[in-house]
């Protein structure tokens, strides 16, 4: 008995071939011997089966001795043994129809779980293997679960159902709703304007929701809400903003915040949350601000950084075009009695300069100049 696998909602063509290459009488029946369709001369006739409006054949092939049964918009319950009667012969084809669906919306928040459910006919024992867009393979039976979805899981999932050494492939498009970056860090000299950007990693026709930025300054004992906003069809409107600092927010996507001045008291970490309409849970992006200050007080030249820096980072003070005078894994370094010239304070990671501030040290009879 030939086995054919079909996909729910698809069209399948079951073949039946006579030895004579001409149009002769044929019938297709199901396992209950109920006629589905056949021919009377050159006319297609249909029986009383449930497939009536979904069954068809290809008249153009009859003259070549081919009498296919075409079933459109397949349903799981179409799984059956179909019998083609032609020239006193019976050809049996077992059709097994499978369906694979995501248990919920295919637009899921980062960190949520995806469950794929296989619909299969009674008596079948299929195995399923799915490959995610990032090449991760998961296997299972009737259900497959992927917990903690990541941004890289967005895209087309390819699932192969295996039964009786035959396979059928499903493709499911999954959209993981997330910010492009889970975390970002902004390095600024004191007094510079700070731009925070929160680009989304997906595009949808209409985007509605609300958001808030909570900020934990390094110098503060508790976090505070810096801004709350609404999002209506990709238009941003500010609801409430703190007075210190006075943040400004862009009116269009991507979400964009401007802090007029980087100051040591603002250095720290923020968490932007975005709740989307009709979705449970929130999108999160962490943002960090590191602020550098170089100062000269009497005979002491000091460089300091505030904010969440890695212990790998090196802070250095050097006279322009010279080797570092002091270079330490600290958040503050200083030089006593610095010689006159342009001094550079550098925050670097493995030699890569992340932040630089210059300060001009004048001969001892003058006052320092901050460029």
């Amino acid at each position: 008995k030939k086995v054919v696998l079909g996909k729910k909602g698809d069209t399948v063509e079951l073949t039946c071939t006579a030895s004579q290459k001409k149009s002769i009488q044929f019938h297709w029946k199901n396992s209950n011997q109920i006629k589905i369709l056949g021919n009377q001369g050159s006319f297609l006739t249909k029986g009383p089966s449930k497939l009536n409006d979904r069954a068809d054949s290809r008249r153009s092939l009859w003259d070549q001795g081919n009498f296919p049964l075409i079933i459109k918009n397949l349903k799981i319950e179409d799984s059956d043994t179909y019998i083609c009667e032609v020239e006193d012969q019976k050809e049996e084809v077992q059709l097994l129809v499978f369906g694979l669906t995501a248990n919920s919306d295919t637009h899921l928040l980062q960190g949520q779980s995806l469950t794929l459910t296989l619909e299969s006919p009674p008596g079948s024992s299929p195995s399923v293997q799915c490959r995610s867009p990032r090449g991760k393979n998961i296997q299972g039976g009737k259900t497959l679960s992927v917990s903690q979805l990541e941004l890289q899981d967005s895209g087309t999932w390819t699932c192969t159902v295996l039964q009786n050494q035959k396979k059928v492939e499903f493709k499911i498009d999954i959209v993981v709703l997330a910010f492009q970056k889970a975390s970002s860090i902004v390095y600024k000299k004191e007094g510079e304007q700070v731009e925070f950007s929160f680009p989304l990693a997906f595009t949808v026709e209409k985007l509605t929701g609300s958001g808030e930025l909570w900020w934990q300054a390094e110098r503060a004992s508790s976090s505070k809400s810096w801004i709350t906003f609404d999002l209506k069809n990709k238009e941003v409107s500010v609801k409430r903003v703190t007075q210190d600092p006075k943040l400004q927010m862009g009116k269009k996507l991507p979400l964009h915040l401007t802090l007029p001045q980087a100051l040591p008291q603002y250095a720290g970490s923020g968490n932007l949350t975005l709740a989307l309409e009709a979705k449970t849970g929130k999108l999160h992006q962490e943002v960090n601000l590191v602020v550098m200050r170089a100062t000269q007080l009497q005979k002491n030249l000091t460089c300091e950084v505030w904010g969440p820096t890695s212990p790998k980072l090196m802070l250095s003070l050097k006279l322009e075009n010279k080797e570092a005078k002091v270079s330490k894994r600290e958040k503050a370094v200083w030089v006593l009695n610095p010689e006159a010239g342009m001094w550079q304070c550098l925050l670097s990671d493995s030699g890569q300069v992340l932040l630089e501030s210059n300060i001009k040290v004048l001969p001892t009879w003058s006052t320092p100049v901050q460029p």
Epitope: K312, A324, K328, R329, S350, G351
Partner: antibody
Framework: QVQLVQSGAEVKKPGASVKVSCKAS????????ISWVRQAPGQGLEWMGW????????GYAQKFQGRVTMTRDTSTSTVYMELSSLRSEDTAVYYC?????????WGQGTMVTVSS | DIVMTQSPDSLAVSLGERATINCKSS????????????LAWYQQKPGQPPKLLIY???SRQSGVPDRFSGSGSGTDFTLTISSLQAEDVAVYYC?????????FGQGTKVEIK
């Protein structure tokens, strides 16, 4: 796993220069600094300086200032250390090492002999 | 510059016994900003490059047997080999990576008694 592969042994005359290469394979070349450390026969380890393959920034130990130059070729994931005005006391094994703070991956070493 | 001084210069220990190497820095290598000790220990066998054993003064590098441990803070540090094995015969170096120039101790040679 990242590997650092160095160029072969060199014999040089006093006053000459030597250029040792260190090629990274099997990983990200530019995310860590590369430090150079030398070891004279039967002696301890001495740090010469570092280079960021990403930015090209360098930092040299005062002792080698003016004699050492570190460069890189990002297309081949290779860092170079050139030491000029060689003297007999520069005879040593020269190592490159991945500087992740501590030196977690080392090259196999390049023996440089300075002899007239 | 920070000077690193190791003691003893050489050490002979019986197989299975404990070996202890000390390292003293001329200035503290404990970062007040990050509360971390920027001290590493290396093992070097003849004809081979050094191998990182310990970083942050007490964190064991992956793949290093747990008989190796590091301790100490500020200026005084110790590398302990709890039960010396034949393959542990080598020269051991401490190194500070708190400030440049990065500096090493003079080395301690460990042998079997």
């Amino acid at each position: 796993q990242v590997q650092l592969v160095q160029s072969g042994a060199e014999v040089k005359k006093p006053g000459a220069s030597v250029k040792v290469s260190c090629k990274a394979s099997g990983g990200t070349f530019s995310s860590y600094a590369i430090s150079w450390v030398r070891q004279a026969p039967g002696q301890g380890l001495e740090w010469m300086g570092w280079m960021s393959p990403n930015s090209g920034n360098t930092g040299y130990a005062q002792k080698f200032q003016g004699r050492v130059t570190m460069t890189r070729d990002t297309s081949t994931s290779t860092v170079y250390m050139e030491l000029s005005s060689l003297r007999s006391e520069d005879t040593a094994v020269y190592y490159c090492a991945r500087d992740s703070g501590a030196f977690d991956i080392w090259g196999q070493g390049t023996m440089v002999t300075v002899s007239s | 510059d920070i000077v690193m001084t190791q003691s003893p210069d050489s050490l002979a220990v019986s197989l299975g016994e404990r070996a202890t190497i000390n390292c003293k820095s001329s200035q503290s290598v404990l970062s007040s900003s990050y509360n971390k000790n920027y001290l590493a220990w290396y093992q070097q066998k003849p004809g081979q490059p050094p191998k990182l054993l310990i970083y942050w003064a007490s964190s064991r590098q992956s793949g290093v047997p747990d008989r190796f441990s590091g301790s100490g803070s500020g200026t005084d540090f110790t590398l302990t080999i709890s039960s010396l094995q034949a393959e542990d015969v080598a020269v051991y170096y401490c190194q500070q990576y708190y400030s440049t120039p990065l500096t090493f101790g003079q080395g301690t040679k460990v042998e079997i008694k």
